[in-house]
Interface confidence: medium
């Protein structure tokens, strides 16, 4: 058991052009709050799927009223952390969705109105008990900066919160084989039991049943030396960084022990320490049955229960090997095109595409704003996968390359004459009409339909439309 903690640092406009308008105004003050949803594993589920690891809602932030004419600033945030308690083990890999909500505090009938302002999502690896991890995510023109961590709740400890601390049997010390449990000085913790057969020389574990290899060693039980051709030393690892090992005259070189056995030199020869289920001089004889649980990573074991019958592991997607011990690195083939990020989810392969690309392998160019420019001061607007240019006055066309004729649509009403102007168009109104588009009739008594004409402007004068 433990708690996932999320600290929001800032929510405001992201870098680059097209700063968003403030979500609040003097007429419509509002305040923000956040929702976080957690799912185990690197799930690709829809945002609406259950938050299997848990969810949390923040408090409401301070009320904010936009200053007229000011750009959207970093908005005031709620106090405190978002905390998502989890009851079971921390999975190590998780997916998150963080939503920014706006609560409008105007004069709505029936109380405040809520609307979703931004949603960000991601998939991360995180060990419980580690330091805060910082992140920046963008949603449209908004940017969210936050930190997160997972911590275990006593009595759980470890990177997955699976090791338990127990009260001491005596007030002053732990019993045989037990350590004090930091930071709980009055409790004790036992060392870990690594995966059966994990090499005591070349493997170690920080979670029960795991076998992590020291540099220079590989394989499910860390018994296989990593070889490279750049070794210079006559025998043994030449450095901790290269993990380089060259066969030499030693009896254990090349590891004569089969099936994950670990080799130790004796004065005259070698000795194999065999993992459970194997025996013989070189661990070559198998006595493993399905009862021994030989299939890793959720593999299905098929075979008889008697010692003489063999077993076969049927591996789930993403794993291979006689014991399903090898993860298939399907991303090494670089299947995602156009710079897409490859995610091997075990059950499936997914590509996270860069902006402007889509498709199972990011093979479709959406022809959006990525790498595109709108000419003559136009700005690119993304939407629906196709890019559109919002052109400056006097220009048109897909990329704002065509000079527009502002008079083509006959914008001047009541027989007014249109003149093209560098900043738009000018309407010269017919007698009896006025306004930017000659849309207002001048009343016979000399008063206009408008409250007042601008000083120094006579009815009938050309009105410039800006």
């Amino acid at each position: 058991a433990g708690v996932f903690e999320l600290q929001i640092h800032s929510f405001g406009p992201g870098p680059g052009p097209g700063a968003p308008r403030s979500p609040c105004s003097a007429r419509l003050p509002c305040r923000l709050f956040f929702r976080v949803c957690l799912k185990p594993g690197l799930s690709e589920e829809a945002a609406e799927s259950p938050c299997a690891l848990g969810a949390a809602l923040s408090a409401r932030g301070p009320v904010y009223t936009e200053q007229p004419g000011a750009p959207a600033p970093d908005l005031p945030l709620p106090d405190g952390l978002l905390q998502v308690p989890f009851r079971d083990a921390w999975p190590g890999t998780f997916s998150f969705i963080i939503e920014t909500w706006r609560e409008e505090l105007g004069d709505q009938i029936g109380g405040p109105a809520w609307s979703l302002l931004a949603r960000v999502a991601g998939r991360r690896r995180l060990a419980a008990g580690g330091p805060w991890a910082r992140d920046i995510q963008r949603a449209g023109a908004w940017e969210l900066r936050f930190s997160y961590r997972a911590r275990c709740e006593p009595p759980a400890v470890g990177t997955a919160c699976t090791r338990l601390c127990r009260p001491r049997s005596a007030p002053s010390r732990c019993g045989p084989g037990l350590r004090p449990c930091a930071p709980l000085e009055d409790e004790c913790e036992a060392p870990l039991v690594c995966r059966a057969g994990c090499s005591p020389e070349h493997g170690f574990c920080e979670q029960p049943g795991e076998c992590r290899c020291l540099e220079g060693w590989t394989g499910p039980l860390c018994t296989v030396p990593v070889s490279t051709s750049s070794c210079l030393s006559p025998r043994g690892p030449s450095s901790a960084t290269t993990g380089c090992l060259v066969p030499g005259p030693g009896p254990c070189d090349g590891n004569p022990c089969a099936n994950g056995g670990s080799c130790s030199e004796t004065p005259r020869s070698f000795e194999c320490t065999c993992p459970r289920g194997f025996y013989g001089l070189r661990c070559e004889v198998s006595g493993v049955t399905c009862a021994d649980g030989p299939c890793f990573n959720g593999g299905l074991c098929v075979g008889g229960a008697d010692p003489d019958s063999a077993y076969i592991c049927h591996c789930p997607p993403g794993f291979q090997g006689s014991n399903c011990e090898k993860r298939v690195d399907r991303c090494s083939l670089q299947p995602c095109r156009n710079g897409g990020l490859c995610l091997d989810l075990g059950h499936a392969l997914r590509c996270r595409c860069r902006a402007g690309f889509a498709g199972p392998r990011c093979e479709h160019d959406l022809d959006d704003c990525a790498g595109r420019a709108c000419a003559n001061g136009g700005t690119c607007v993304e939407g629906g996968g196709a890019h559109r240019c919002s052109c400056a006055l006097g220009f048109g066309g897909r990329d704002c390359r065509e000079r527009a004729d502002p008079c083509a649509a006959r914008p001047c009403a009541h027989g007014g004459r249109c003149y093209a102007h560098f900043s738009g168009l000018v309407c010269a109104c017919a007698p009896g009409y006025m306004g930017a588009r000659c849309e207002f009739p001048v009343h016979p008594d000399g008063a206009s339909a408008l409250p007042a004409a601008p000083p120094g402007l006579r009815p009938g004068d050309p009105q410039r439309y800006l």
């Epitope: 470890g158 020291l214 540099e215």
Partner: antibody, heavy 120, light 112 residues
Amino acid sequence: EVQLLESGGGLVQPGGSLRLSCAASGFTFSSYAMSWVRQAPGKGLEWVAAINSNGGNTYYADSVKGRFTISRDNSKNTLYLQMNSLRAEDTAVYYCARHRGGFYYAVDYWGQGTLVTVSS
Amino acid sequence: DIVMTQSPDSLAVSLGERATINCKSSQSVLYSSNQKNYLAWYQQKPGQPPKLLIYWASTRESGVPDRFSGSGSGTDFTLTISSLQAEDVAVYYCHQYLSSRTFGQGTRLEIK
């Protein structure tokens, strides 16, 4: 080649503070638990503190608990020992040491040590 | 904490002869779940940091000459140097890492 280089030792008055650093190279620092071990002049070895690979768990000898803090910065490949409320009996050579793997493993590499002298 | 007691405090052995150092723990350092003894042996020469010789009570560290061997289980352990060489002159420490971490007081090995 695994290398551990301690620094930050020196002369300090009783009650003072000192921060030791240990720069690690030649291995993937973030994969290994680390310890500080000290040796008073002419005496034996005394384990001081340890920290697991990601910095999430720390352990201390009773003699330094509440006064010393072990920490690490995996991005800088550096181990630290913050020593406060120093006493004369803390005078020793302080060694930075790497565990063979996780926390529950023997120490396999040691630095050359840095001398801390607590005296008025 | 587990107290580690080495014997003898000092030892003089002729070159080529066998040297034996004993270490006794105040409680067992054998962890029943994995049947490992959480005990290591270190060698320290003057002006140098300690060097790991043996871990898991009997596993020799890579690069350590095979004249060094460790044995024992539970509470009683032995470091044996089968044929003493001049470069073996040093102080030897046993170290348990099962419950907190403690060292023996050290055994000084000299040439007779």
